[in-house]
Amino acid sequence: ESSNQASLSCDRNGICKGSSGSLNSIPSGLTEAVKSLDLSNNRITYISNSDLQRCVNLQALVLTSNGINTIEEDSFSSLGSLEHLDLSYNYLSNLSSSWFKPLSSLTFLNLLGNPYKTLGETSLFSHLTKLQILRVGNMDTFTKIQRKDFAGLTFLEELEIDASDLQSYEPKSLKSIQNVSHLILHMKQHILLLEIFVDVTSSVECLELRDTDLDTFHFSELSTGETNSLIKKFTFRNVKITDESLFQVMKLLNQISGLLELEFDDCTLNGVGNFRASDNDRVIDPGKVETLTIRRLHIPRFYLFYDLSTLYSLTERVKRITVENSKVFLVPCLLSQHLKSLEYLDLSENLMVEEYLKNSACEDAWPSLQTLILRQNHLASLEKTGETLLTLKNLTNIDISKNSFHSMPETCQWPEKMKYLNLSSTRIHSVTGCIPKTLEILDVSNNNLNLFSLNLPQLKELYISRNKLMTLPDASLLPMLLVLKISRNAITTFSKEQLDSFHTLKTLEAGGNNFICSCEFLSFTQEQQALAKVLIDWPANYLCDSPSHVRGQQVQDVRLSVSECHRT
């Protein structure tokens, strides 16, 4: 017991941490002072009635990844204040409703990864009226969802069910919950997907399907009497799909009248872009979908892709598209022209070069586009990039950060409405008249700049941290500046006069520089009370670099001797 006790440390607020130790039981002597108890990753196998008896003020109990196989009936009887209970990844093969009955304050319950076959003989959660987040199920033994399982639950913020190996679903089991903001469903096979879908369509706002093989999925008409679907967002995560089954999935999505957002994360498309509908299939209506997000899409036969034209007509109403880290090197001109409502396009972490971007941003492409993100692609010439985007008349925001431009020409052409340009982490070592005068926000942080002497009359925000600047920029060149972030440069000092010359400046972040703590600098920074309002990272990030005897100390704390300040 004494070694058990030694593995636990508690602070004055009653936050007790004893994770990743060698505890084989809950430490003794726990009192009402304990508010939070984390005993995750230990070797606890048994919880007795007396272990937590005195913990009447306990609000969070984390017991994940132990070897718990037994919990005595009244183990949690005194935990009326408990809000967060995590029993995930233990060896609980039978769940008892008596554990949860006293937990009237519980808002979070995680029972994932325990080897139970069902959620018990009686309704486990019917007394948990405040429950907001519930996680249940496991990867292999949880095979059956019963009608009584979720009885008594009316509203949940999040419900996660690991039904990876589900073999039986009793109709209406999930219908009893009136509203679920976010349902996460792990299912290896799709056999029971439609039955579950029918039950949740009118109660779930955001439906997420994980780890499912949809290669052979076939949609058959739903036996649902009602069509008033609540689902606004459908996410497919780590799902396998083919050309044919994608078409079937779209038929399923057709049933969701109010669907606004569609997301595919870490999915695999085993296809070649053959999305042609068979003759007897009616045309798919994309409904109201406004946002399409695709991240890390894996297409094993990517270079066999040949025809996306059947999907073009489905895209005309989409307003926001993200296709990130999916090896995109070209968006067909015709597709761009069909994206008539598109306002936001994020193609981060792809393979775009200027010459192929030209094909994508062809005449009449993306006519409504306001924001284009091409972060971390294969762009190499600012001049070519700007020129290529001239066709986009409504473009105001461009993020081309994390491309290697190195140099910047003296002049460039850009869409005339440009307001925001992100050139951070592009290896540039100077800024020139290539930067458009219309900008209101410019980000050139994390580059090799040692000078900033551009006149940008409309600029309101300048982000220029992590460069090699030795002084603040000349304020007369930036008459409208509100925000200047210039931390982690090589600035040694700045004066009251310099700051005052930025007439409109509201926010300055200049920490992480090599300040020479002269008497003038210290008196200015320490006497100006108003400075703390402007310097958002003051005082923590303002350290003296010299004189050597005060190096590393906060500027606000440094006091130089009279003799140091009055040398003639």
């Epitope: 890390r296 894996h298 036969r301 270079y303 066999l304 880290n325 090896k327 995109v328 090197f329 070209l330 067909p332 001109c333 015709l334 597709l335 972490e349 393979l351 775009m352 070069v353 010459e355 192929y356 094909n359 971390q376 294969h378 994390k402 290697s404």
Partner: antibody, heavy 118, light 111 residues
Framework: QVQLQQSGPELVNPGASVKLSCKAS????????INWVKQGPGQGLEWIGW????????NFNENFKDKAALTVDTSSSTAYMELHSLTSEDSAVYFC???????????WGQGTTVTVSS | DIELTQSPASLAVSLGQRATISCRAS??????????MQWYQQKPGQPPKLLIF???NVESGVPVRFSGSGSGTDFSLNIHPVEEDDIVMYFC?????????FGGGTKLEIK
């Protein structure tokens, strides 16, 4: 500037394996694909396959599927190609090359000569 | 596999004149309006060097005397005027379908 530095020449016995390296500098290694290309003595170029350091995904020419294994070490910005069960047919110069825009090879290593002989 | 046939296998040209090398693909290398065809130059004992990508885009740093044209299955590399330094080997390469393939090469010679 962008550079791909390949390991030195290899003389190996038939049936043995050899591991060639290609160290990248001057660009963000994880943003580009690395391709490998074979050029037999006095012959043309043959594409072996690629690897994307960001996610480790690979794609091979079927002719090399059982011959070559591609790996990367992102911490040292180095790509590797291991050739197995070598025969005299595998004697060639092997190039690594950076894949840009998903379609073209804009920077090449100097090549590693592999000679298979007993 | 897409087969690329380069012609001629060797081409004798006079310095200052135009050289045209052809590359024919066994099937189209078009990808939504872009031809995924590249041209490389290789000097003896050196790796190939990219000249042209996407059929007609000249790689940065490549002299303007090099140009590429063509679409579908028929492509050509033009060098005008030919200089001494250009009398080397040239390869075409497609990246429309895996496996990517190269042409057999064309050797430029002085007439």
């Amino acid at each position: 500037q962008v550079q791909l530095q390949q390991s030195g020449p290899e003389l190996v016995n038939p049936g043995a394996s050899v591991k060639l390296s290609c160290k990248a500098s001057g660009f963000t290694f994880t943003t580009y694909g690395i391709n490998w290309v074979k050029q037999g003595p006095g012959q043309g170029l043959e594409w072996i396959g690629w690897i994307y350091p960001r996610d480790g995904s690979t794609n091979f020419n079927e002719n090399f599927k059982d011959k070559a294994a591609l790996t990367v070490d992102t911490s040292s910005s180095t790509a590797y190609m291991e050739l197995h069960s070598l025969t005299s047919e595998d004697s060639a110069v092997y190039f690594c090359a950076r894949l840009t825009g998903g379609t073209f090879l804009d920077y090449w290593g100097q090549g590693t000569t592999v000679t298979v002989s007993s | 596999d897409i087969e690329l046939t380069q012609s001629p296998a060797s081409l004798a040209v006079s310095l200052g004149q135009r050289a045209t090398i052809s590359c024919r693909a066994s099937e189209s290398v078009e990808y939504y309006g872009t031809s995924l065809m590249q041209w490389y130059q290789q000097k003896p004992g050196q790796p190939p060097k990219l000249l042209i990508f996407g059929a007609s885009n000249v790689e940065s740093g490549v002299p303007v005397r090099f140009s590429g044209s063509g679409s579908g299955t028929d492509f050509s590399l033009n060098i005008h005027p030919v200089e001494e330094d250009d009398i080397v080997m040239y390869f075409c390469q497609q990246s429309r379908k895996l496996p990517w393939t190269f042409g057999g090469g064309t050797k430029l010679e002085i007439k």
